[in-house]
Amino acid sequence: YFGKLESKLSVIRNLNDQVLFIDQGNRPLFEDMTDSDCRDNAPRTIFIISMYKDSQPRGMAVTISVKCEKISTLSCENKIISFKEMNPPDNIKDTKSDIIFFQRSVPGHDNKMQFESSSYEGYFLACEKERDLFKLILKKEDELGDRSIMFTVQNED
């Protein structure tokens, strides 16, 4: 069971300091941006991280949403990353959810975060380079210290 607590506005970056944003086709990607670029591209660069109380504490349970024309929430249903047109619900009556991720700091690196799927244990949000693009994917952790599954989260409130 997950019960919604507070939400915060955040900028999410990969370890190359590229900013996560949602393009016009609702596609998540990471791009080099100055702070000015980041502000100019808001709200597509600003993510609503909603925290949830977890009946089985396993890390900080969160949803990740973005509000452009409508609110879309990140899902990893079927191990496929997509943004679904929905508000983060107040309550989720299950121990797993396709929209709940466990946000945890990387051991020894308090400022680096990982997001593990609550539906698929051992699967993490990751940044993958494909052609000249840096995409958001879901990835099974294969090796310790995999930098592709580490992010920084900067609160904008």
Epitope: G25, R27, P28, I81, I137, K139
Partner: antibody, heavy 121, light 108 residues
């Protein structure tokens, strides 16, 4: 380059077995579903099944369940489609295609070039 | 399963003219619909997803519309390279995806 490369044309007799392959490169193959699609001569596209190479989870179309086997070898970034006993009606072009994630979710965003299978006595 | 029906089966249009291809779902597919183009001897190529969003490098003359059970692919001014077979595909209840039977767009 992001691509799926399929094995070559096959000519087989009815009753024979066959395994065709689809090798992904240029992306994290273990993080995307691969689908198999049949196209019989002069006909449309039919979804056969999916495999997630990261853990070999499979989903089959009811039409093809029990008729074919889909597998993967993640160490070689390769998915396979196999038949234990071919029929003349299996003659078709078979495509593998990647299922989009993040970008183009749930659609087939990258396609292999196709493997033509001909079954004839 | 959701059955997808495309019409017409064949559409004859002159270059420079507008082409409108239709796709109907037997039950709601929401906006979870894609369009693919296939040329002879080639694999299909993704053109439109979520009913109306063009994939990368797809020209602006292609536009998709619709939701629920009725969908349309429109090509505003046909170029010679646009003559091909177009398939719609629903993915609303993935993994149970289904394709339409295709519309052949030919030169008039």
């Amino acid at each position: 380059e992001v691509q799926l490369v399929q094995s070559g044309t096959e000519v087989k007799k009815p009753g024979e077995s066959l395994k065709i392959s689809c090798k992904g490169s240029g992306y994290t193959v273990t993080s995307y579903w691969i689908g198999w699609v049949r196209q019989m001569p002069g006909k449309g596209l039919e979804w056969m099944g999916f495999i997630y190479p990261g853990d070999s989870e499979t989903r089959y179309s009811p039409t093809f369940q029990g008729q074919v086997t889909i597998s993967a070898d993640k160490s070689f970034n390769t998915a396979f489609l196999q038949w234990s006993s071919l029929k003349a009606s299996d003659t078709a072009m078979y495509y593998c295609a990647r299922v989009g994630s993040g970008w183009y979710p749930y659609t087939f965003d990258i396609w292999g070039q196709g493997t033509l299978v001909t079954v004839s006595s | 399963e959701i059955v997808m029906t495309q019409s017409p089966a064949t559409l004859s249009v002159s270059p420079g003219e507008r082409a409108t291809l239709s796709c109907r779902a037997s039950e709601s597919a929401s906006s979870n619909l894609a369009w693919y183009q296939q040329k002879p001897g080639q694999a299909p190529r993704l053109f439109i997803y979520t009913a109306s969003t063009r994939a990368t490098d797809i020209p602006a003359r292609f536009s998709g519309s619709g939701s629920g059970t009725e969908f349309t692919l429109t090509i505003s001014s046909l170029q010679s390279e646009d003559f091909a077979v177009y398939y719609c595909q629903q993915y609303n209840n993935w993994p149970s995806i289904t394709f339409g039977q295709g519309t052949r767009l030919e030169i008039k």
